[in-house]
Interface confidence: medium
């Protein structure tokens, strides 16, 4: 069986799949996923291995019409290091010189200047190219190569080993070299995998079985850090509690080098925030930090000075915590604004079971803002996903130069922000450079400000705008309005009528469904409509709501359904990646990110059109 | 490399008790499970009594409720109490520990202390 890093090369225009027959004969053979032969795998950025002979594809030297054999993987050759180029074509690094089938006297596969269909290869059995299946780092863990990452293959005992192995050892741990040749250089670590015993490498707290692993003797970058612990299906510690940071403060006392976690600002337009989207509440820095740098946008622990926190420069090289297991933010569920009946006074804005309303020209401080909209029988709003968020911005009519009151303060309990109604905190948006929680100025309070409607610690006594937000009360069946411009069950936004398609279809249905509807699969024209969109799908149970972006006309070029530019984009992390595919909304935590999807996958979606009387613009010229 | 150093063996009367220590030190991680063994004669060398990082046991049948094996993380050390001793458990004990060290291999032995059950 093949494992989801191995793949067969095949030639489309012959049909066949390239074959190492022996280290010195790689020809091509009818495809057999069967055959070790013809299995290969990516064990760099550049080289590729046999898996039979765990040597790697080279060639003796850069020049057109030479034999492309095996040869001991070595990650310094430049006769090793092969790039995908545009499409298929697979060749040298820095050459024009491509990997060809050879010919009918040439039973070889060769290097050759000729990028024609000889030269074309693809994974079997997929459209995708040799890159589509590339390399991930693997970092390890303990050992005494302070957590550098594998190399595959790695020589232990004059044996090679291309994945991670327990030789050498009765207790099934698994590890790998990190260089080459072991048995000259001595260089190992454990591999980040799930194996018999390694859950002794992470630390329990019995009190909320969160389980915390300290990577002390690692020197890591953050993103490699990151990197790491994801890849032990975990992220870089955050901490939202009180009792969590003195249980790390227990967990490390016995360490003096700092230590990554997953703070950051590395959102170009948003303040502090957590890699594993836990939100920002709760702050323990170092007297002196966040210092405002450029550049120092990650942070790390410091056992040393009490496990206070200072942000460094993501390129350093430290030790990190990795945090997986239970979270304490799923407890508090949201409702989702299709399940709730909102009925609101007048001048009250409805969403998701409850009523808003922004307060911009009685201008108060936080505690009378606070007084007030006790009064109307809410309190200062809360805010707990980015859809809740997104519908505040784009539906009640919030401006760009707004400065108003939340409900959020650490009032209470200094360094440790808590909404005024007393429901969790389960999500924040900072401004970039916020919280900046500056003790000479006692900023204890939160606004909403900024075209995004970002948040940003304030002094309580400043006379502000601020916002309600109240219960609804529900009052018998739901009468639905029909919007004006947009016919029953659409909803309007600006211009246009949207429509949730509520049957499970594939992009091309969902497509042929909308264009029945005299509509067509949505586009997404800027974060305004975005904004919009979010709120419309985000807080729904289905996980994803098809768009009209695809790559299918053209691969890696993603266009809309109709003839439209795109002028916005707003891709989930490692998105679009080389994923050829149909794009979709992502709802949940991931609220109204891109993801590509295989375009045959089932997904509910979204319908557009021009509401009835409106005027469309002119088509700006380019 | 990681060394072994088992101690508190000697010549005890039929009926009696004793306690092994074997200590553990060098380029460990952490430790995964640290027992005792002694020669046996179909095998070169039978398990007696092992315990993991987390405190799990096993004990060989023949030494079950007389003998009782404990550990102190923080020391690296593995300890054996032996109650109710009788002369065929005369043997060299010898401490092994499989750990997770800073090199690949896991399996290290002691080397050995002689307890002697006689009148």
């Known amino acids: 069986l093949l494992d989801t890093r191995q793949f067969l090369i095949y030639n489309e225009d012959h049909k066949r799949c390239v074959d190492a027959v022996s280290p010195s004969a790689v020809q091509t053979a009818a495809c057999n996923q069967d055959a070790e032969s013809q299995k290969f795998r990516w064990v760099s950025e550049s080289q590729i291995m046999s898996v039979a002979f765990k040597l790697c594809l080279g060639v003796p030297s850069k020049t057109d019409w030479v034999a492309i054999t095996l040869y001991a993987c070595d990650s310094k050759s430049e006769f090793q290091k092969w790039e995908c180029k545009n499409d298929t074509l697979l060749g040298i690094k820095g050459e024009d010189l491509f990997f060809n089938y050879g010919n009918r006297q040439e039973k070889n596969i060769m290097l050759y200047k000729g990028s024609g269909l000889w030269s074309r290869w693809k994974i079997y059995g997929t459209t995708d190219n040799l890159c589509s299946r590339g390399y991930e780092a693997m970092y390890t863990l303990l050992g005494n190569a302070n957590g550098a990452t594998c190399a595959f293959p790695f020589k232990f005992e004059n044996k090679w080993y291309a994945d991670c192995t327990s030789a050498g050892r009765s207790d099934g741990w698994l590890w790998c070299g990190t260089t080459t040749d072991y048995d000259t250089d001595k260089l190992f670590g454990y591999c980040p995998l799930k194996f018999e015993g390694s859950e002794s490498l992470w630390n329990k707290d019995p009190l909320t079985s969160v389980s915390y692993q300290i990577n002390s003797k690692s020197a890591l970058t953050w993103h490699q850090a990151r990197k790491s612990c994801q890849q032990q299906n975990a992220e870089l510690l955050s901490i939202t509690e009180i009792h969590e940071q003195t249980y790390l403060t227990g967990l490390t006392s016995s360490l003096t080098s700092g230590l990554w976690i997953g703070l950051n600002s590395l959102s170009f337009n948003s303040g502090w925030q957590w890699s594993d989207r836990s939100p920002f509440r709760y702050l323990n820095w170092l007297p002196g930090s966040p210092s405002a740098e450029p550049g120092k946008s990650c942070v790390s622990l410091n056992p040393g000075k009490n496990a206070k926190w200072e942000n460094l420069e993501c390129v350093q090289k430290l030790g990190y915590i990795c945090k997986k297991g239970n979270t304490t933010l799923n407890s508090f569920v949201i409702p989702s604004e299709s399940d709730v009946p909102t009925h609101c006074p007048s001048q009250w804005w409805p969403y998701a079971g409850h009523c808003y309303k922004i307060h911009r020209d009685e201008k108060k401080i936080q505690r009378d803002a606070l007084t007030t909209c006790r009064k109307e029988g809410g309190d200062l709003t809360s805010i707990h996903t980015i859809e809740e968020l997104d519908f505040i911005i784009s539906q009640l009519g919030y401006e760009p130069n707004d400065e108003l009151w939340i409900g959020l303060n650490d009032i209470k309990i200094q360094m440790y922000f808590e909404w005024s109604d007393g429901t969790p905190v389960t999500f924040t948006k900072w401004l970039r450079g916020e919280p900046s929680h500056e003790n000479n100025r006692q900023e204890d309070c939160v606004v909403m400000k900024g075209k995004d409607g970002y948040w940003a610690d304030r002094g309580c006594e400043w006379p502000l705008g601020y916002i309600c937000k109240m219960k609804s009360r529900s009052q018998g069946p739901e009468i639905v309005e029909v919007e004006k411009g947009c016919r029953k069950g659409w909803k309007k936004h600006h211009f246009y009528c949207y429509m949730i398609g509520h049957t499970l279809s594939t992009f091309a249905e969902a497509n042929q469904t909308c264009n029945n509807e005299n509509a067509y699969l949505t586009t997404i024209e800027d974060r305004y409509e975005q904004a919009f969109l979010t709120s419309f799908v985000g807080l729904r149970p289905e996980k994803y709501f098809w768009t009209g972006l695809s790559d299918i006309q053209t691969k890696g070029t993603f266009q809309w359904t109709i003839e439209e530019e795109v002028r916005f984009t707003h891709w989930n992390s490692d998105m679009p990646g080389r994923k050829p595919g149909c794009v979709a909304m992502r709802t949940g935590i991931a609220g109204g990110l891109w993801d590509v999807l295989k375009c045959d996958e089932k997904a509910k979606f979204v319908c557009k059109h021009w509401a009835e009387g409106v005027t469309h613009p002119p088509k700006p010229t380019t | 490399y990681v060394q072994l150093a088992e101690s508190g063996g000697g010549l005890v009367q039929p009926g009696g008790s004793l306690i092994l220590s074997c200590a553990a030190s060098g380029s460990i991680c952490t430790s995964n499970a640290m027992g005792w063994y002694r020669p046996a004669l179909w095998k070169q060398r039978e398990e007696v009594a092992d315990i993991t990082s987390g405190g799990s046991?096993?004990?060989?049948?023949s030494v079950k409720g007389r003998f009782t094996i404990s550990r102190d993380n923080a020391k690296n050390t593995v300890y054996l109490q032996m109650n109710s001793l009788k002369p065929k458990v005369t043997a060299v004990y010898y401490c092994k520990a499989v750990v997770v060290t800073t090199t690949p291999y896991s399996d290290y032995w002691g080397q050995g202390t002689l307890v002697t059950v006689s009148s």
């Open positions: 046991t096993n004990y060989a049948d």
